[in-house]
Interface confidence: medium
């Protein structure tokens, strides 16, 4: 059955982030009320035109490649960029649009038969055999500056919290990072015991809102170290 009859708050369609933080595998993440549970099989977020974060070319569309948006930019921040057309500069094959490849730093036509095998290999490297669906991709133009400056709404794909609208932060949700609500008083939060542990979460929570801090819930003081529940509390 398709459990997609939802009200307008699009984040409710996201896969339920239960088990959320690495430090609290048993506690529910209150991203939004009414989140769907497995049984139905489709969940969809709101449409958005935020820069799409990526770690490698295969995570982008067929007409895109993964790179830092600025020349010599932060290597840790990469997004899907529109592919380079023929005669444009390139550093690797993936930068060139379909039907082209990178030769001596320039995108050239790959009409030559000897290159076909390499293109096929790149396509099948993607998860799923895309041969049947490649035709379904429409041509995409480069990102306009408007796309970069639109603040993401709840559920929008993001790179960092500054990409999100007020009251939202950028946090991981399964594989991607999306805009989620900043936590309110009383909501469960994640207290990171060691530096860098935030990156281990598959479903990250936002941080606590202004005037709040993430502390052990009073009635959980007696609980064992691993099961202590943290909530957003007034300073």
């Amino acid at each position: 059955t398709l459990n997609s009859v939802l009200n307008s708050n699009a984040i409710k369609n996201l896969p339920p982030p239960l088990g959320g933080a690495a430090g609290h595998p048993g506690s529910a993440v209150s991203a939004a009320p009414g989140i769907l549970y497995p049984g139905g099989n489709k969940y969809q977020t709101i449409d958005n035109y935020q820069p799409y974060p990526c770690a490698e070319d295969e995570e982008c569309g067929t007409d895109e490649y993964c790179a830092s948006p600025t020349r010599g930019g932060d290597a840790g921040v990469q997004i899907c960029l529109a592919c380079r057309k023929r005669r444009k500069r390139c550093m690797r094959h993936a930068m060139c649009c379909p039907g082209n490849y990178c030769k001596n730093g320039i995108c050239v036509s790959s009409d030559q038969n000897h290159f076909r095998g390499e293109i096929e290999e790149t396509i099948t490297e993607s998860f799923g055999n895309d041969h049947s669906t490649l035709d379904g991709y429409s041509r995409r133009t480069t990102l306009s500056s408007k796309m970069y400056h639109t603040k993401g709404q709840e559920g929008s794909v993001c790179l960092r919290s500054s990409d999100c609208a007020s009251g939202l932060c950028c946090a991981r949700h399964f594989w991607s990072k999306i805009c989620k609500p900043v936590l309110k008083e009383g909501q469960v939060c994640t207290k990171h015991r060691r530096k860098g542990s935030h990156g281990l979460e598959i479903f990250q929570r936002c941080y606590c809102g202004e005037g709040l801090s993430c502390r052990i819930q009073k009635d959980h003081h007696q609980a064992s170290n691993s099961s202590r529940l943290h909530t957003c509390q007034r300073h």
Epitope: N13, K42, Y43, D47, E59, F127, G136, R140, W175
Partner: nanobody
């Protein structure tokens, strides 16, 4: 319509192994990642493992690291979860999930699809 069908669940003794499969059909978009989640009786559902589309990047829950291995067969649109050194606490319904781009652009809405689950029971 996209369908994810899990198989490979069953009864196994502690210390034993099982291999779960998740076959995807009706795909008209490109996956970004596939993963496994599980829900034990009376407990919240939890993340187990995930693999990105190219298969080069994987993530695991701390509780299964070193015991479970996620992999994917591109040609069959199938993801696998090899579960070794199983413990009674691994008993749960295991769900397959997929995160995908829209069919025309990765900036389209992200789409999430779920399977119906397969039961894994670890008991002597």
């Amino acid at each position: 319509e996209v369908q994810l069908v899990e198989s490979g669940g069953g009864l196994v003794q502690p210390g034993g192994s099982l291999r779960l499969s998740c076959a995807a059909s009706g795909i008209t978009f490109r996956f970004k990642a596939m993963g496994w989640f599980r829900q034990a009786p009376g407990k919240e559902r939890e993340f187990v493992a995930a693999i990105n589309r190219s298969g080069r990047s994987t993530r695991y829950a701390d509780s299964v690291k070193g015991r479970f291995t996620i992999s994917a067969d591109n040609s069959k649109n199938t993801a696998y979860l090899q579960m070794n050194s199983l413990k009674p606490e691994d008993t749960a319904v295991y769900y397959c999930a997929a995160e995908s781009h829209g069919s025309t652009s990765p900036r389209n809405p992200l789409q999430y699809d779920w399977g119906q689950g397969t039961l894994v029971t670890v008991s002597s």
